[in-house]
Amino acid sequence: SERCDDWGLDTMRQIQVFEDEPARIKCPLFEHFLKFNYSTAHSAGLTLIWYWTRQDRDLEEPINFRLPENRISKEKDVLWFRPTLLNDTGNYTCMLRNTTYCSKVAFPLEVVQKDSCFNSPMKLPVHKLYIEYGIQRITCPNVDGYFPSSVKPTITWYMGCYKIQNFNNVIPEGMNLSFLIALISNNGNYTCVVTYPENGRTFHLTRTLTVKVVGSPKNAVPPVIHSPNDHVVYEKEPGEELLIPCTVYFSFLMDSRNEVWWTIDGKKPDDITIDVTINESISHSRTEDETRTQILSIKKVTSEDLKRSYVCHARSAKGEVAKAAKVKQKVPAPRYTVELACGFGAT
């Protein structure tokens, strides 16, 4: 066969669908690889061909579009399963071609099973809600294109195994689930089950997402440096180890990059010659506020090192702060026999 631009296996698109549910899968060529859409390709005389490789097999085979009740069909650039079966799992290829042009891409499709509480190996999207922020909504995801707007589906929402009914602060409103005032207790997995009729059959779409309640922007503050502070002095003798923690609290801010760094005499540690190491640890509160600790360590400090300026810096979308550590050389305790005796006029 003639040359074909093969984009290989697009593992970025690890598509997971539930067993015994409808699935519509768009050919990734038009979404990620080619600069034109299906309509343009079709009107230019290009044909879209589908085939697949079963799980644990090497043999590419055509997709059977003659199954009872058109279980698998193709419509424009979409491959339809009505519904899926467990053994539909495999690598699917869509190829766009005519006599002079050919381009193809493969992608993995995994049909997964769920239990009665909607537990499954499905990777769940995470939706963040602000704590105590007023009414916020989540929407049943990825159900567009399954039924026409004239069809009115029934939607049932669940938290874990339990249908959402008479919850204190959560109200199902069709495709939306409203949180009157989001609390930590609202953390969890929420599932919408969309039921709709098609050609005398009833289909179900199950979509689960994880809700994570996070700090509200109303309560967000610039970074707070807890250490170093004015109450602690790092007093060392030359040759001792100097350890200075920089501990910074960051309010949760959506999409904010939190940064902590040290400067020594105004320079980054990498840019100076002294033997310094920095270890970082990060912890999160239940609302995803973040505490970062960077420990600056000099194994054997010199008297020159003890004269330097050590400043901890922190930055978030809310602002930038800095705090200098109080570092000084320990004055050696007087040795009685020599210093004190001299002081008393002994010769």
Epitope: S116, C117, N119, C161, Y162, N166, V170
Partner: antibody, heavy 119, light 107 residues
């Protein structure tokens, strides 16, 4: 170690109500559902209903709808099951059981409360 | 509601022998089935969930199998402490329902 401790045996007259308590110790009360199951003498197990303490939502079997009320007090980690309009066939041992929000089986049970309905 | 039917009602087995208990659902419950053991005067104890997964602390002689409508609990070698009543329970659909129980007695 999580434990569910139920209130003591009750003898009730037909037409009256009974309220059975189930106190959880060992933490995590709010993160679980509490289910109620009953067992008539020499009979099998019958699911009555459940409550999600943190969400304040209760669920009931059709058979008991309107006659059973399940509540919870998070401050004392205690769930309650109240059954009204008692009749002799309600004589049974009533169990509470802990169930995870995402796991639908009963892993920890109370010791049971015998309710006898007799005139 | 889904009706769970257990058989036999009573099973007489000698210690050390194998016991096989059956549970049938009136419609498919997938693998959403649990088995419980109950001894006289005690609360039930979870043995198996997900049709075949042993609960924490349950000895390996207990095993569950099946999916859909037909399920089996097998006790490979009966010990004296295994003589009890065994219940299956489906949690595929609300309301959750139990079988009527199988009593395993000493032969």
């Amino acid at each position: 170690q999580v434990q569910l401790v139920q209130s003591g045996a009750e003898v009730k007259k037909p037409g009256s109500s009974v309220k059975v308590s189930c106190k959880a110790s060992g933490g995590g009360f709010s993160e679980y559902a509490i289910h109620w199951v009953r067992q008539a003498p020499g009979q099998g197990l019958e699911w009555m209903g459940a409550i999600l303490p943190e969400q304040g939502a209760a669920y009931y079997a059709q058979k008991f709808q309107g006659r059973v009320t399940i509540t919870a007090d998070e401050s004392t980690s205690t769930a309650y099951m109240e059954l009204s309009s008692l009749r002799s066939e309600d004589t049974a041992v009533y169990y509470c059981a802990r169930v995870g929000l995402y796991v639908p089986y009963m892993d920890i049970w109370g010791q049971g409360t015998l309710v006898t309905v007799s005139s | 509601e889904i009706v769970m039917t257990q058989s036999p009602a009573t099973l007489s087995v000698s210690p050390g022998e194998r016991a096989t208990l059956s549970c049938r659902a009136s419609q498919s419950v997938s693998s959403n089935l649990a088995w419980y053991q109950q001894k006289p005067g005690q609360a039930p104890r979870l043995l198996i969930y997900g049709a075949s997964t042993r609960a924490t602390g349950i000895p390996a002689r207990f095993s569950g199998s099946g999916s859909g409508t037909e399920f089996t609990l097998t006790i490979s070698s009966l010990q004296s402490e295994d003589f009890a009543v065994y219940y299956c329970q489906q949690y595929n659909n609300w309301p959750w329902t139990f079988g009527q129980g199988t009593k395993v007695e000493i032969k």
